[in-house]
């Protein structure tokens, strides 16, 4: 064509595929009446007709175009609908009159790459490789032109470096035009990149100016030889009997070599193998005291078959052994002293104390509780308490029951209970004493007798109220070797002028109706007489 | 120290009476229960009867009641077992023994033989 | 009369063993935490010797190697490590109630 040399550069149009490129005719009137004009695409240097313009009305040649032309801006505009890759070309606009001129504009076509995919290689690389190996593979998909691809390590950029970092990128086009980056980067690493964070960043052209897209961070694993195993126990600090106490092996190696836990049996100083459970931790629960003692862990490559033993460390799970108290069961007569020495044995220093069982009442600070001049009050329960204080919840107790000899002693000497004619009456007697005393009673019914504790008894009668136990009362008569005593219980006839809500009188009342032989019991509702009890 | 020591024991024939005596030493006499405890020859052992010398209340075991009596002397803290109507089954060693309030014998005398034979 | 079973009746055991006798009794013989069961040992021609009283104390001056342990009707009396003067009869005995009754005894032999 004459005067081609001489052309000017196409004008360029920048678009986003799918969107609508406006060509307009850059042709002047001086070069051409814009009523009659003809639109070309040239592709590999051949020029197509794809759009006339005739007295300012624009006609679609048939073709790939023909669906997504149209006129604007009365005529100087083509628009170009739906652009897709292949319609990155040359464009240009023929005037026909004076004389043919021609204006030429360059599209340029733009889309986004998705988010880059990346995905690190799942089998590891090991640090002792003698060329780079694959770390990771990103993939960035639709993306037109095709985008830049830049490496990161812990956010530095990766350049290529002969026999350490390979970038190896390549690209497909996909049937719409659109092209996949595909970018694997291969790199020798060393021990410390085990916690490296990698990732690829896409930079890409838009219309708007430079754009980049970044994948996720990943890690790659390394595989690296252990160089040392050690123990680890939990919880940390002090262990105490009945902890749930987990010992586990660690090494510096990836993959971890394959672990046993021993313990030094302390007799033979043998290391004996520990069952350890499916994650090789071996649990202690409840931990004893025999779980202490010096453990050690044993990692063996099972590709190199090198076996590397830890540091022992000593485990002391702390105990407080069962208390001893002696005498174990003492008996006093009134009067007399008792000693009670209190023994145990710990793994830490102990405190003792002395308490009274009934009350709490701390009595002795010390492993010996000395009681003097002994009352028969002084009978029952004391405690011993060792404990270690350095360690909260590590202690153990004994109860000792002291047993003052002498008769029987009542739980009342005289009692009143409301009673009705005919029916069955539950009464009960309460005596302790050392020996154990057994209880008897002065009328006939159906007794039986409870033991309270070794030095107490309760004995209940169920009994028919007659008119002759109305007279007499009732009497338990406690009694061992050393003596007996009674208590009287004295029945009296319920009538409704005594049946006061507040009544300080009534000792027991039966709410059953007085219907012969209804059996009631007086002793649920009892209060005792207002007068003090006798101790007989 | 703490001392039982029987005495009374020998060869007796069948339907006799027979005596023994327990004597204490070195302990209150009148605060601890003593028992009579038996044992025929190659066999167990077998409660006879108890007293608290305190008191002097006896208790026997229903088998012995009416043929053996338990008594005591204080002043010279010295228990009996009288054995009346005497069978060959009672050809048994005779123990003494002590105890407190819970009945278990913590001091044993080294025992008496008594053989029922004609 | 409450009956007291032990078991076995003859036990043969060496130096060093570890050796288990139980008794059973007819009818619980615990109150609140005491168990009246004793355990004596005899040796022939001799008194029998307390060992252990109230189930689990052990007497003054016997041995640690001898412990017993139970309630209500069933109790056991071990010697963790079997010594040459171990060896004799071992007898239980109750005192929960009149008349005190002991176990028929286990003869504790050298094998």
């Known amino acids: 064509v004459p005067g081609e040399a001489e052309q000017p550069a196409p004008e360029l149009v920048e678009v986003e595929v799918g969107s609508t490129a406006l060509l307009k005719c850059g042709l002047s009137q001086s070069q051409g009446n814009l009523s009659h004009v003809d639109w070309f695409s040239v592709h590999k240097e051949k020029r197509t007709l794809i759009f006339r313009v005739r007295q300012g009305q624009g006609q679609s040649e048939p073709g790939e175009y023909e669906q997504r032309l149209s006129l604007q801006d009365r005529g100087a505009t083509l628009a170009l609908t739906q652009v897709t890759p292949q319609d990155e070309r040359i464009f240009l606009c023929q005037g026909k009159r004076p004389r043919s001129q021609e204006y030429r504009i360059q599209l340029r076509v733009y889309k986004a790459p998705e988010e880059p995919n990346i995905q690190v290689n799942p089998l590891g690389i090991p640090v002792n490789s003698k060329e780079p190996e694959e770390v990771a593979t990103c993939v960035g998909r639709n993306g037109y032109p095709i985008p830049q691809v830049i490496w990161y390590k812990n956010g530095r950029p990766l350049k290529e470096e002969k026999n350490r970092v390979h970038i190896q990128s390549s690209q497909t086009v996909e049937s719409s035009g659109l092209y996949t980056l595909q970018s694997i980067l291969k790199a020798q690493l060393v021990k410390e990149d085990k916690d490296a964070q990698f990732y690829c960043e896409l930079n890409y052209r838009l219309p708007s100016g430079n754009h980049m897209k970044e994948s996720r961070e990943v890690t790659v694993p390394v595989f690296y030889p252990t160089e040392k195993v050690w123990l680890e126990v939990e919880p940390v600090g002090m262990l105490k009997e009945g902890d749930r106490v987990e010992i586990r092996c660690l090494a510096d190696g990836n993959p971890p070599p394959h672990f046993s836990i021993s313990k030094q049996n302390p007799s033979t100083r043998e290391a004996e193998e520990e069952t350890t459970n499916d994650n090789g931790v071996l649990v202690l629960e409840p931990a004893r005291k025999e779980h202490s003692g010096r453990y050690e862990c044993q990692g063996l490559d099972l590709d190199t078959m090198i076996s590397l033993l830890s540091e022992p460390q000593e485990l002391l799970v702390n105990y407080v052994s069962d208390v001893r108290v002696s005498p174990a069961a003492p008996e006093r007569q009134e009067g007399s002293s008792l000693t009670l020495t209190c023994e145990a044995e710990s793994s830490q220093d102990l405190e003792f104390q002395w308490l009274r069982e009934e009350t709490g009442q701390v009595l002795e600070r010390g492993p010996v509780l000395q009681l003097h001049d002994l009352k028969r009050e002084a009978g029952g329960g004391y405690r011993c308490v060792a404990s270690v204080p350095s360690i909260p919840g590590l202690n153990r107790t004994q109860l000792v029951n002291v047993a003052i000899f002498g008769p029987p002693w009542m739980a009342f000497k005289e009692r009143k209970v409301w009673v009705k004619e005919n029916m069955v009456l539950n009464l009960s007697c309460e005596a302790s004493g050392h020996p154990r005393p057994t209880i008897s009673w002065n009328v006939n019914g159906t007794a039986s007798e409870q033991d309270q504790d070794p030095q107490r008894v309760l004995s209940t009668l169920n009994v028919l109220v007659t008119p002759e136990l109305l007279e007499t009362g009732v009497e338990c008569t406690a009694s061992n070797d050393l003596g007996k005593n009674t208590s009287i219980l004295f029945l009296e006839l319920v009538n409704l002028t005594t049946l006061t809500p507040d009544s300080n009188t009534t000792t027991g009342l039966s709410t059953s109706t007085a219907s012969p032989h209804t059996r009631a019991n007086s002793t649920s509702t009892e209060r005792k007489l207002p007068e003090p009890e006798s101790r007989g | 120290q703490v001392q039982l020591v029987e005495s009374g024991g020998g060869v007796v024939q069948p339907g006799r009476s027979l005596r023994l005596s327990c004597a204490a030493s070195?302990?209150?006499?009148?605060?601890?229960?003593i028992h009579w405890v038996r044992q025929a020859p190659g066999k167990g052992l077998e409660w006879v009867a108890r007293?608290?010398?305190?008191?002097?209340?006896?208790y026997y075991n229903e088998k012995f009641k009416g043929r053996f009596t338990i008594s005591r002397d204080k002043s010279k803290n010295t228990l009996y077992l009288q054995m009346n109507s005497l069978r060959a089954e009672d050809t048994a060693v005779y123990y003494c023994?002590?105890?407190?309030?819970?009945?278990?014998?913590?001091?044993w005398g080294a025992g008496t033989m008594v053989t029922v034979s004609s | 009369d409450i009956v007291m079973t032990q078991s076995p009746s003859s036990l043969s055991a060496s130096v060093g063993d570890r050796v288990t006798i139980t008794c059973r009794a007819s009818?619980?013989?615990?109150?609140?935490?005491?168990?009246?069961m004793h355990w004596y040992q005899q040796k022939p021609g001799k008194a029998p010797k307390l060992l252990i009283y109230?189930?689990?104390n052990l007497e003054s001056g016997v041995p640690s190697r001898f412990s017993g342990s139970g309630s209500g009707t069933d109790f056991t009396l071990t010697i963790s490590s079997l010594q040459p003067e171990d060896f004799a009869t071992y007898y239980c005995?109750?005192?929960?109630?009149?008349?005190?009754?002991f176990g028929q005894g286990t003869k504790l032999e050298i094998k």
């Open positions: 023994a002590r105890s407190g309030g819970y009945w278990y014998f913590d001091v």
């Open positions: 070195g302990f209150t006499f009148s605060n601890y229960w």
């Open positions: 007293i608290y010398p305190g008191t002097d209340i006896t």
């Open positions: 009818k619980s013989v615990s109150i609140s935490g005491y168990s009246y």
């Open positions: 109230l189930a689990s």
């Open positions: 005995q109750h005192s929960r109630e009149l008349p005190y009754t």
